[in-house]
């Protein structure tokens, strides 16, 4: 056993800061520094077969599978994966140490399997296995966080039961309103889970891995705030932990805060109380009131109530499963071609929705604002003046919810014109939706006023491009007709547009003029 | 080059919470099958195995003191953090952290690494 | 739970001897189990793993047999630097467990 080599396999991340795609051993890229993978002989294998530990990539990712070697003399190798042989070129680095490296760019699934290295060396031979596989994200999940209270200490707890371990901070701010805006300067942030100071006006706490980032307000009654046009409600579903934080300020320490459910006072355990000196030298008091597990008969009005302040409210209500509350009638609008416009959805959701907006197949991020009355409202105005179909779509993981609206731009026709041997055709998307006329040209109606009144067919909105009506209508062909000049016209309020076609003898390339008056 | 390092406090008081931190380097819970053991010896007895936690988040538990452990790992830190509840004198020990290797065939190669270990008093 | 016997808990032998290491399981663990070798004051160190595998850059007087329940670590010649406490570990199923060690003096 002591002419073993002495082997160390290793993993290098690549950030990767290019598109290419291939394997290779010397690619310039941003590179974290290398992580051992604990390379050990396989028990009870057939010849010295060395193995790694199994590697878990992202889709995309890059990576380096790195082989030292502190073995005498020369070595040479092979890789050899999914049975086809890969270039293998070692080289020796200062140490003196073989080393033998395969680059996987941008990972796929079909660059997930086992990487066998062969090493020939003077004294022996030997195998090492590596196995690459795509880290599964179909088991990931991110879930909001929560607070719990840290035993025997005055500290809030923040937990995030969620795959991959989610990194969690929180995020505090000591202004009103606007300010308190995640990229502000009046928002601090603290990587860690355990958060003591608990005085500040606005206090999240938010979970972040690989699926995104959720947050959770701590719900607060400030009694120095002058209280909401309606009452603050907030929303918990059955078995989740409810925590309210009721905070006054006062000149001195001479006054004091309790919290009552439908005018009876919380029991003992279900509060706890602190207090400090701002820098102004006012006192600061902190009440919590919660519940680790809610139940339904914890639904009802909390009360904070201050011997020097006019007590607050808030509505808790308890629900079996979350909801999404909002009229999903459609909405059609109709607006002129550079007139500012945005759709908007007001709603009500526990828990927090997430959101997509799509037209034409495609997907726009989804912003969403609380309001004040305790709904909440998604806007999108980044429509480009294209008339169509726009859908909202949300879910919370209890309930799904989707909205239909239309968007028609108020402008004149475009027509388009094409001719067969049997029948010549028009259609414009113009809005409101367009009428039709035809008319001859002749020698008697040079000006192309002469009515056609027989064999005109007018289909209106016949074909929906992304919600977008089209109108169309067609002449059918007399033979006395051919050879002779005609108009179709389009008109709407807001005006007329005409193409001319010539109605050739039968042919297979009918001529069509652009005319448009 | 693996190494582990454990940290915290030296000394705590009946009934309070100990926390732990294993900080890791040259290896890390994010990208290989690993896992990184908790480990504990009193003085002048034998070692008693405790808690893992491995890179896809599984995490195992000592039966007789499930109740009172947690773990939990933070990856941008290359931290494993254990924390055990209502400490007793009982619980005076040198706490370890040490590594396990999960390979492709499916067999784990444990402890192949270990921190040099903090010893912990639980004293009034 | 399984358990784990090791014996004898102590021992007395000479530089050079040959010295033999015993542990027991409570019920049959295949071959998941490693040795380890600890010094006063400090952590322990892998020397065999899978019951037979020795770990990279230890020795080759130490060697590893057996599976199912019977396991002994053996010193074919033992060194001064060999005088330490040793201990086995079955990790077949949870809790992983410990044997109580066998400390390995100077005769």
């Known amino acids: 056993n002591q002419d073993l080599p002495v082997i160390k396999c290793v993993l290098i991340n690549h950030k990767n800061n290019d598109s290419s795609v291939g394997k290779s051993s010397s690619y310039p890229m941003v590179s974290e520094s290398p992580e051992d993978l604990g390379c050990a002989l396989r028990p009870q294998s057939a010849g010295t077969v060395y193995e790694a530990a199994t590697v878990e990539v992202d889709v995309s990712a890059s990576i380096t599978l790195q082989v030292l070697v502190d073995t005498p003399g020369n070595i040479s190798c092979l890789w050899v994966f999914k049975h086809s042989s890969l270039n293998c070129q070692p080289h020796f680095d200062v140490q003196n140490r073989g080393v033998v490296s395969m680059v996987i760019l941008k990972m796929t699934e079909t660059q997930a399997g086992e990487y066998l290295l062969f090493i020939q060396s003077e004294a022996t031979n030997y195998t090492i296995l590596f196995t690459v596989s795509i880290r599964n994200t179909l088991l990931f999940t991110l879930r909001r966080p929560y607070f719990r209270k840290m035993e025997n200490q005055d500290a809030l707890v923040c937990i995030s039961e969620s795959v991959p371990e989610p990194i969690v901070e929180w995020v505090l701010c000591d202004s009103q309103g606007e300010s308190c805006k995640e990229e502000s300067p009046a928002v601090v942030k603290k990587e860690e889970k355990v958060l003591h100071e608990l005085f500040g006006t606005d206090i999240r706490c938010c979970a972040r891995n690989e699926l995104g980032r959720e947050c959770t307000r701590l719900f607060t009654i400030d009694l120095n705030q002058t209280p909401q046009t309606t009452l603050p409600q907030l929303f918990l579903k059955v078995g989740e932990p409810l925590w309210i934080r009721c905070k006054a300020v006062h000149v001195n320490h001479g006054f004091g805060l309790t919290w009552e459910l439908e005018n009876k006072a919380l029991e003992e355990g279900s509060y706890f109380e602190m207090s400090t000196y701002s820098t102004n030298r006012t006192m600061i008091r902190i009440l919590f009131a919660f519940v680790s597990s809610v139940a339904r008969n914890d639904t009802g009005y909390y009360t904070c109530s201050s011997s020097k302040h006019p007590s607050q409210s808030a509505l808790v209500t308890i629900v079996e499963k979350g909801f999404i509350n909002a009229t999903n009638s459609s909405e059609d609008y109709e607006i002129d071609q550079y007139e500012e416009f945005c759709f908007s959805v007001r709603f009500k959701a526990y828990p927090q929705i997430r959101c997509t907006w799509t037209f034409s197949r495609k997907s726009f991020p989804c912003e969403q604002k609380g309001l004040d009355d305790g709904y909440s409202v998604s806007k999108f105005c980044n429509h480009k003046h294209q008339p169509g179909e726009y859908i909202f779509h949300a879910e919370n993981g209890d309930a799904q919810f989707t909205k239909m609206f239309t968007l028609n731009i108020r402008r004149k026709p475009q027509v388009l014109a094409e001719a067969s041997a049997s029948q010549a055709s028009c259609s414009s998307d113009g809005y409101p939706l367009p009428s039709w006329t035809w008319k001859k040209c002749s020698d008697k109606s040079p000006n192309c006023t002469e009515d056609i009144p027989e064999g005109v067919w007018n289909r209106k909105a016949n074909r929906k491009v992304f919600g977008q009506w089209v109108s169309s209508s067609t002449l059918n062909m007399s033979e006395a007709m051919k050879g002779f000049l005609v108009k179709c016209c389009a008109y709407n309020s807001l005006g007329t547009s005409c193409e001319t076609i010539l109605l050739n003898s039968p042919g297979p390339f009918p001529f069509i003029q652009d005319s448009i008056s | 080059q693996v190494t582990l390092k454990e940290s915290g406090p030296a000394l705590v008081k009946p009934t309070e919470t100990l926390t732990l931190t294993c900080t890791l380097s040259g290896f890390s819970l994010n990208n290989a099958r690993m896992a990184v053991s908790w480990i504990r010896q009193p003085p002048g007895k034998c070692l008693e195995w405790l808690a893992h936690?491995?890179?896809?988040?599984?995490?195992s538990y000592s039966t007789s003191l499930k109740s009172r452990l947690t773990i939990s790992k933070d990856t941008s830190k290359s931290q494993v953090v254990l924390t055990m509840t209502n400490m007793d004198p009982e619980d005076t020990a040198t706490y370890y952290c040490?590594?396990?290797?999960?390979?492709?065939?499916?067999?784990?190669?444990?402890?192949?690494?270990w921190g040099q270990g903090i010893l912990v008093t639980v004293s009034s | 739970d399984i358990q784990m016997t090791q014996s004898p808990s102590s021992l007395s032998a000479s530089v050079g001897d040959r010295v033999t290491i015993t542990c027991r399981a409570s019920q049959g663990i295949r071959n998941d189990l490693a040795w380890y070798q600890q010094k006063p004051g400090k952590a322990p160190k892998r020397l065999i793993y899978?019951?037979?595998s020795l770990q990279s850059g230890v020795p080759s007087r130490f060697s590893g047999s057996g599976s199912g329940t019977e396991f002994t670590l053996t010193i074919s010649s033992l060194q001064p630097e060999d005088f330490a406490t040793y201990y086995c570990?079955?990790?077949?199923?949870?809790?992983?467990?410990f044997g109580c060690g066998t400390k390995v003096e100077i005769k």
């Open positions: 936690i491995f890179s896809n988040d599984e995490k």
């Open positions: 899978a019951a037979s």
């Open positions: 570990l079955q990790h077949n199923s949870y809790p992983l467990t």
């Open positions: 040490a590594r396990i290797v999960g390979y492709g065939t499916g067999w784990y190669g444990f402890f192949d690494y």
